[in-house]
């Protein structure tokens, strides 16, 4: 054999006895008839030698160390060569060592070509016998980053100040390339960064530096995980120890792109996050240890990357191609913001782009899927605009306000479906006619259905909320003067079953001056509760609202107000109420800012209740609640 090392190679080759075996016959290195058991060849030297036995691989090992000095000159970055070529070396178990020394401010990055690396723990070995041992340096102290086999996920390791990489090849292994390159990076300001890339499903077990010994005091180590957006990652700690901290706290930090609370800070004993979609970083931060009894910080953990479970594997088609002026947003339902990590919950478009919020617009067919352990964490909000620009074309036109079935079939709860109904100013008004008569939600008689309609003005400057209405009441229709939004809001998952009860028709009708008119047809023996719009905030200034209350021929209606006085104090104008019998046109007028409210009154025929507000002083608003009860006429009411 001849080993010739160029002067500029900075390589030293050492052939020495390996682990002693119980072989009877000793073996020697023979150089010009001299028998030796160790041979050192430095760069710029050439040595010719032989072995005194047939199977030197059973006796000797060879170490090839290349020193790379990035302190005094430029660093030879790029693909690292196996030098001398393995074909020129004796067939012994060989270890190639690259020792790179650099300034503290220089970041060094080892880049591993495919196959990437898989970290192994103490006592483990690599199936093919090829191992990569990587060390870093903190001042004069060597820090073991880890031992790795082939066929894993580790693609890059970044360090600073220096790196020592040892590649061990068994004597029979044909490998003739190092499989890695070195690049320079800016300072990473930590011990190291390990990048782990998942192409698909899989798992990786990783360990803190020096494992199973202690992680260096007050150091920081980061793992960067690259995970396809359609897969989910979960972290579990297999083994950890905490040291005795004098200052600071040992912790792990997660950085999740898109998270509002980065970094997410965890104790090592906490349950670690699962179900994360896409890339994330995990950092281990040590503390200042107690000098007398430091203890050790160490961590061994597993990252499991897999396809999401159950619902999340399905693809849902949301066909909005025939819709106009509509947008559907799937988003996280609000929760109290906690510093605790909550696994990611994402919605994906075409199974590719996943995010916590997704808005779908009308005019297209969309394919979506979910990456979420618990779909109740998401909800849907839909907005649709129905507008009339030409009053001659729209008059008497009707539209059905119904949630499309495509949306109802999604596994995410519908929160709000809002219809914005727009009319030309002072030209047209609107009438809402429900499929099933509506009940107004009041404290006295709350809605207990799975959904309600929230009706409010859609004029930006006007703060007018007509109220919340649910099926199963006496309100036959609601007429409104101008632009409104009608929001179907769900309150329970059972809405899916009750969806058939939804149904509201809007028609464009000739313009009228009153803000709103409620047509009420009470049912016998049920008490109908009605209240003025903007309950709790007061009817807006100079607003007029009416209730058209039908009384069947054989019934008597009892109209009851729930307070003695309205409580309104007018700054300008007058607030009044008119109760008018429809048949006789007889009316009673009450000054709401002066008079007491009427005692319960009985009406044998349909009647109007009209309430008009003044400009009240602040804090003295107009809020009225009244009820209508029908009883048969035969009963003696005295």
């Amino acid at each position: 054999f001849e080993i010739a090392l160029p002067r500029e190679s900075n390589i030293t080759v050492l052939i020495k006895l390996g682990t002693p075996t119980l072989l009877a016959k000793p073996c020697y290195i023979v150089i010009s008839k001299r028998h030796i058991t160790m041979l050192s060849i430095k760069s710029g030297e050439r040595i010719v030698f032989t072995f005194s036995c047939q199977s030197p691989e059973n006796h000797f090992v060879i170490e090839i160390q290349k020193n790379i000095d990035c302190m005094s000159g430029p660093c030879p970055f790029g693909e690292v060569q196996l030098q001398p070529s393995t074909s020129l070396l004796p067939t012994l178990n060989r270890t190639f060592i690259w020792d790179v020394k650099a300034h503290k401010s220089i970041g060094l990055e080892l880049q591993f070509s495919i196959p990437r690396l898989r970290q192994i723990g103490p006592g483990e070995s690599c199936p093919d016998g090829v191992t990569h041992s990587i060390s870093g340096r903190i001042d004069a102290t060597v820090v073991r980053i880890g031992t790795f086999c082939s066929n894993g996920t580790v693609s890059r390791i970044k360090m600073q100040e220096g790196v020592k990489m040892a590649l061990h090849l068994p004597w029979f292994h044909p490998r003739n390339v190092s499989g890695f390159s070195i690049a320079n990076r800016s300072s990473i300001k930590r011990l190291c960064i390990i990048e782990s890339v998942f192409e698909g499903e899989g798992s990786a077990t990783l360990m803190s530096a020096n494992y199973p010994e202690g992680f260096p005091e007050d150091e920081l180590m980061t793992w960067q995980f690259v995970v396809p957006a359609h897969l989910r990652a979960s972290v579990s700690f297999l083994n950890f120890n905490l040291s005795n901290c004098e200052r600071k706290e040992e912790r792990v930090e997660y950085y999740i792109p898109g998270s509002t609370t980065n970094p997410e800070v965890f104790k090592l004993e906490d349950k670690q996050p699962g179900n994360m979609a896409g890339n994330f970083n995990l950092s281990l931060q040590g503390c200042d240890q107690d000098a007398q009894s430091p203890g050790i910080l160490r961590l061994q953990f597993q990252v499991l990357v897999q396809h999401p479970q159950n619902e999340s594997n399905k693809i849902y088609v949301v066909d909005l191609s025939n819709e106009r002026a509509m947008s559907l947003t799937i988003e996280p339902r609000p929760v109290k913001q906690s510093r605790k990590f909550v696994p990611g919950c994402f919605v994906c478009l075409e199974s590719r782009t996943c995010s916590s919020n997704l808005t779908l617009t009308s005019g297209s067919k969309h394919k979506i899927s979910f990456l979420c352990d618990d779909l109740t964490r998401l909800w849907m909000n839909v907005e649709k605009t129905i507008s009339c620009t030409d009053h001659r074309y729209c008059q008497r036109k009707s539209y059905s306000l119904q949630v499309p079935s495509d949306i109802l079939h999604l596994p995410v709860e519908l929160h709000d479906f809002s219809w914005k109904l727009l009319v030309p100013k002072d030209r047209l008004s609107l009438v809402l006619v429900p499929a099933q008569k509506l009940q107004q939600h009041t404290h006295e008689k709350p809605c207990n259905t799975s959904f309600s309609y929230l009706v409010a003005s859609a004029i930006p400057s006007q703060d007018l909320y007509f109220g919340s209405f649910c099926p199963g009441g006496s309100i036959k229709q609601i007429q409104v003067k101008q632009n409104i939004s009608v929001t179907l809001r769900t309150f329970a998952p059972s809405f899916q079953q009750e969806a058939s009860r939804q149904g509201l028709t809007v028609s464009f009708i000739p313009y009228f001056k009153e803000e709103g008119v409620f047509t009420v047809t009470p049912d016998t023996k049920s008490k109908v509760y009605l209240r003025t719009p903007n309950w709790d905030r007061g009817l807006p200034s100079l607003t007029s609202v009416s209730w058209n209350i039908s009384v069947p021929r054989d019934q008597v209606a009892c109209l009851t107000f729930f307070k003695e006085r309205s409580g309104v104090v007018c700054q300008t104008g007058r607030a009044f109420m008119i109760i008018q019998e429809q048949r006789t046109r007889a009316e009673e007028i009450f000054s709401l800012d002066e008079d007491v409210l009427p005692k319960p009154s009985f009406h044998h025929h349909s009647f109007w209740v009209n309430i008009s507000n003044c400009s009240p002083t602040s804090g003295k608003q107009l809020d009225l609640l009244f009820s209508v009860t029908l009883t048969p006429r035969t009963v003696d009411l005295t």
Partner: antibody
Framework: EVKLVESGPGLVKPSQSLSLTCTVT?????????WNWIRQFPGNKLEWMGY???????SYNPSLKSRISVTRDTSKNQFFLQLKSVTIEDTATYFC?????????????WGQGTTVTVSS | EIVLTQSPLSLPVSLGDQASISCRSR???????????LDWYLQKPGQSPKLLIY???IRFSGVPDRFSGSRSGTDFTLKISRVEAEDLGIYYC?????????FGGGTKLEIK
């Protein structure tokens, strides 16, 4: 006796490649030695350019690294210099030389040199 | 790159005199293997350079013993004990310890 002879065009146009051949007699280029190219500029300044060793290892002057290539043809016992994208600054006398790399460590044997002018 | 500074630039001597040429380096020329690859060459007019001394002080085969090399730290000296007419020409020092290998600027030995 080891003898080296350089050959190649004496005139090269700027931006073109310069190619020189060194024919070695009296010694096999695969037996030993490092086979160098060295040039001498007008004014006598000498510059080591690079070498190819008997076992195919190459080493180049970093100032030329992106432009230089030293190769060999063992069947003809020749080694070659290729210098790309030449400029008038590459006008020089080019020597090929053999050195007992692992012995003297020096450049022991030199060719007589060939003058190359870079001009349009 | 290692810069080798030779002095003097020109050295006029009489035949039979002793001549001394200096070569100075700012950095050590000791290689990690312990060798110092510092050589001396003579280039006679119209000829290629010829090796005289290698590894600081070892004479190349066929070089007369009036040529000697020595060192003091990073200062290297070539001495010719009795100059003969055939010794005239330009003397170059050369280092092969660190890539790029470099030559000194040369010292011209001429007759007074």
């Amino acid at each position: 006796e080891v003898k080296l002879v350089e050959s190649g065009p004496g005139l090269v146009k700027p931006s073109q490649s310069l190619s020189l051949t060194c024919t070695v007699t009296g010694y096999s280029i695969t037996s030993d030695y490092a086979w160098n190219w060295i040039r001498q500029f007008p004014g006598n300044k000498l510059e080591w350019m690079g070498y190819i060793s008997y076992n195919t290892y190459t080493s180049y002057n970093p100032s030329l690294k992106s432009r230089i290539s030293v190769t060999r043809d063992t069947s003809k016992n020749q080694f070659f210099l290729q210098l790309k994208s030449v400029t008038i600054e590459d006008t020089a006398t080019y020597f090929c030389a053999g050195g007992d790399y692992y012995g003297t460590g020096a450049v022991d044997y030199w060719g007589q040199g060939t003058t190359v002018t870079v001009s349009s | 790159e290692i810069v080798l500074t030779q002095s003097p630039l020109s050295l006029p001597v009489s035949l039979g005199d002793q001549a001394s040429i200096s070569c100075r380096s700012r950095q050590t020329l000791v290689h990690t293997n312990g060798n110092t690859y510092l050589d001396w060459y003579l280039q006679k007019p119209g000829q290629s350079p010829k090796l005289l001394i290698y590894k600081v002080s070892i004479r190349f085969s066929g070089v007369p013993d009036r040529f000697s090399g020595s060192r003091s730290g990073t200062d290297f000296t070539l001495k010719i004990s009795r100059v003969e007419a055939e010794d005239l020409g330009i003397y170059y020092c050369f280092q092969g310890s660190h890539v790029p290998w470099t030559f000194g600027g040369g010292t011209k030995l001429e007759i007074k």
